[in-house]
């Protein structure tokens, strides 16, 4: 494995990031900030790339299936959380097929830096970006119900994942901004009919003096829909992260009355209509907050909380937040439990009986990397657990109870040592199913002076396709030394976040 020039592998890095985004099933598109390191290895007629990419979350849902550079800048009508990440990627290309880049595996860590960038010393605290987004499922459900009232074709959609929640407080108003994915759950389910996914953004506004949080002053919700039927069949086995693996990605439109406006632009304003919301979270549960006190008067938004979150992830990317389905957690074959290995080698919480803690939420424990400002893990490595998933995308979201019996399995990698996943009382460990290709770990928000911990580099061995010795693994251990001609330059426009990335790697 030899170091290579970061600028020389820019096309591969850009393509690899696109493939990673298309593989992911929840969260927001990663945008490339910088190629932090690059090595390559030539095995016969195949080139193996070992890339380290510095990324930033965009405001476009991965469901949009957009190319990462085609995501427009964020919508300034809504607060935009600043989340950075770093991905270690192994990709291959056949020398004679220049377009045929395949991502073999990837591991990413992400973290919000909004709090670290905020200088709140002399400022009233007015913006909160909540890590525990599940608390706001009730508000998402209510917003979606309101949308359904005016969009008959959304009747069978249900809330899937609560992706982001922000609260803006001050002056005469409070606002809650909730992003969530939805999926179509038709009554008559045809076995080969792929689900239709959507993404909604709801803004809920309240008077500051409003005691009745069931009646927002305004509710604006925009939804867009993505139909996997227009792409490859998600029920089949997707290619090896090569050839864009689309399972959702075009907004539906029609020349007559469009069921959904392009770009999610159908807005709804509902003055003084009843709208249920849970109580606001107690002040000590705020995650990080920032903002100006409202001047002459804008209004407020409202709080959201989640009472009974019956929700299962449908992702296979191990990803940002791992949702928990109280009712069917024992049966859910793809449930991501936070008791799988934490990226920092320990979970900052005690094991809760109902397993509501997630990779994102660390409100009570010490900051898992608070004392490691240079990104070195105290244990010297990041024993991230791989989440179990197959290439066969068996997708149990909010629509169906998952089957008791899991079908076939692919590679059979077990859980990290000592980390059998707990089930319910009196039950043995859940069988660990197929290892997923690629993972994204959401770490707690970074603080000032901290840098993003590096993702793990202990990828499993893999044989290269079309290789003479298919049983012989072809990937080398991920390089730990940094290439001399790296890191590359940050893309313009993101100087503020550069301080949160390590500039060299541990030797």
């Amino acid at each position: 494995v030899s170091p290579t020039d970061c600028s020389a592998v820019e096309p591969e890095a850009e393509k690899a990031l696109d493939l990673i985004n298309k593989r992911r099933r929840d969260g927001y598109l990663f945008q490339l900030l910088r190629i932090a390191d690059a090595h390559l290895d030539r095995v016969e007629n195949t080139t193996v790339y070992y890339l380290v990419l510095d990324v930033q979350e965009s405001d476009c849902s991965v469901l949009s299936r957009k190319y990462w550079n085609d995501c427009e800048p964020p919508d300034s009508r809504r607060p935009s959380e600043i989340v950075i990440g770093q991905c270690k990627v192994i990709a291959t290309r056949h020398s004679h097929e220049s377009q045929d880049l395949r991502v073999i595996d990837f591991n990413c860590t992400t973290s919000s830096v909004s709090s670290a960038l905020a200088n709140t010393k002399d400022s009233p605290v007015l913006i909160d970006f909540f890590e525990d987004t599940e608390r706001y499922r009730k508000q998402a459900n209510k917003a979606l119900e309101k949308y359904k009232e005016e969009n008959d074709d959304f009747a069978s959609f249900r809330v899937d994942r609560i992706e982001r929640v922000a609260r803006v407080r001050g002056g005469e108003g409070t606002g809650y901004f909730v992003d969530f994915s939805v999926r179509n759950c038709p009554r008559h389910h045809f076995p080969r009919h792929p689900n239709v996914f959507g993404f909604c953004r709801a803004d809920l506004f309240y008077d500051v003096e409003a005691l009745d949080l069931e009646s927002p002053k305004n509710l604006v919700i925009n939804c867009e829909v993505f139909d996997p039927q227009e792409h490859e069949n998600i029920n089949g086995v997707p290619p090896h992260l090569g050839h864009p693996f689309h399972w959702g990605g075009h907004e539906r439109s029609s020349t007559t009355k469009p069921p959904f406006k392009p770009h999610g632009s159908r807005d709804h304003h509902h003055p003084h209509k009843p709208h249920e919301h849970g109580p606001p979270p107690p002040p000590d549960e705020r995650d990080h907050s920032h903002g100006p006190p409202l001047p002459q008067g804008p209004p407020p938004l409202l709080p959201m909380s989640c009472s009974s979150c019956q929700h299962a992830t449908f992702g296979t990317n191990g990803a940002q937040r791992h949702s928990h389905n109280n009712n069917s957690s024992d049966l859910h074959p793809h449930k991501h439990h936070s008791h799988e290995q934490h990226p920092h080698g320990h979970h900052p919480h005690a094991h809760h009986p109902h397993e509501h803690d997630t990779h994102r939420q660390h409100p009570h424990g010490h900051h898992p990397h608070g004392h490691h400002p240079h990104g070195h893990h105290p244990h010297g490595h990041h024993p991230h657990g791989h989440h179990p998933h197959c290439h066969d995308f068996q997708d149990y979201g909010p629509c169906d109870p998952p089957p008791h019996n899991q079908g076939h399995c692919c590679h059979g990698h077990g859980p990290p040592p000592g980390h059998l996943r707990r089930r319910g009382p009196g039950k043995g460990p859940r069988p660990f199913h197929c290892r997923q290709i690629g993972s994204v770990y959401r770490l707690p928000p970074l603080r000032k002076g901290e840098v993003l911990p590096l993702p793990e580099a202990n990828f499993p061995s893999f044989p290269l396709p079309h290789h003479k010795h298919p049983l012989k693994p072809d990937n080398q251990p991920f390089p730990q030394s940094v290439s001399e001609s790296c890191p590359g330059k940050f893309k313009s426009g993101f100087p503020q976040v550069s301080m949160f990335f390590t500039h060299t790697f541990p030797k």
Epitope: R77, S114, I127, P292, P298, F494
Partner: antibody, heavy 118, light 108 residues
């Protein structure tokens, strides 16, 4: 107390560039969009674009792409707008304003008068 | 771009008179994203009415706002001398954000 303090008036030659500053106090600078608005004498308000200081993300009105460039320094809580290749059409008062989510441009700077004259 | 047309461009009203000015959008605007600003000569604009009908802090209750879709209005129930100013409507429903040309309100 939220305040936006803009730099002083500028008299510029055609073809030159000018950089206007807007120092923010009393709120968390990095998390609110900073808007830039142009007002020519006797004319209405025209949106130039906006920047989110924390990320550096910027949106521009198509009309001002290539004319205006936004930057922000989070260490000094200051936003900047550079105007290039100045002509008499650029003579105007330029305002910075905070976009308060849900409520429009809630706080405004006092304005910076830019005069372009040979 | 969503063009906002304000009418009249200039109007004068006697003290105590009821005043209404309108703002018409070339394409529909969510009422959550329609605001009004007041500007007096030599001063910066001030947020005056937000989300169509909500008065900003310190704005007298004689002001009101209403509308939906492409048609919005600002009304003063009883004109007072301090209300003489230019009023701008503003949408940020779809980028680019746009302002109306303004209605200059003078005292008769």
């Amino acid at each position: 107390q939220v305040q936006l303090q803009q730099s002083g008036a500028e008299l510029m030659k055609p073809g030159a560039s000018v950089k206007i500053s807007c120092k923010a106090t009393g709120y968390t600078f990095s998390t609110f969009w900073m808007e830039w608005v142009k007002q020519r004498p006797g004319h209405g308000l025209e949106w130039i674009g906006e920047i989110l200081p924390g990320s550096g993300n910027a949106n521009y009105n198509e009309k001002f792409k290539g004319k205006a460039t936004f930057t922000a320094d989070t260490s000094s809580n200051t936003a900047y707008m550079q105007l290039s290749s100045l002509t008499s059409e650029d003579s105007a008062v330029y305002y910075c304003a905070i976009h308060y989510y849900g409520y429009g441009f809630a706080y405004w700077g006092q304005g910076t008068l830019v005069t372009v004259s040979a | 771009d969503n063009v906002l047309t304000q009418s009249p461009a200039i109007m004068s009203a006697s003290l105590g008179e009821r005043v209404t000015m309108t703002c018409t959008a070339s394409s529909s605007v969510s009422s959550s994203y329609l605001h009004w600003y007041q500007q007096k000569p030599g001063s910066s604009p001030k947020l005056w009415i937000y989300t169509t009908s909500n008065l900003a802090s310190g704005v007298p209750v004689r002001f009101s706002g209403s509308g939906s879709g492409t048609s919005y209005s600002l009304t003063i129930s009883s004109m007072e001398a301090e209300d003489a100013a230019t009023y701008y409507c503003h949408q940020y429903h779809r980028s680019p954000w746009t302002f109306g040309g303004g209605t200059k309100l003078e005292i008769k």
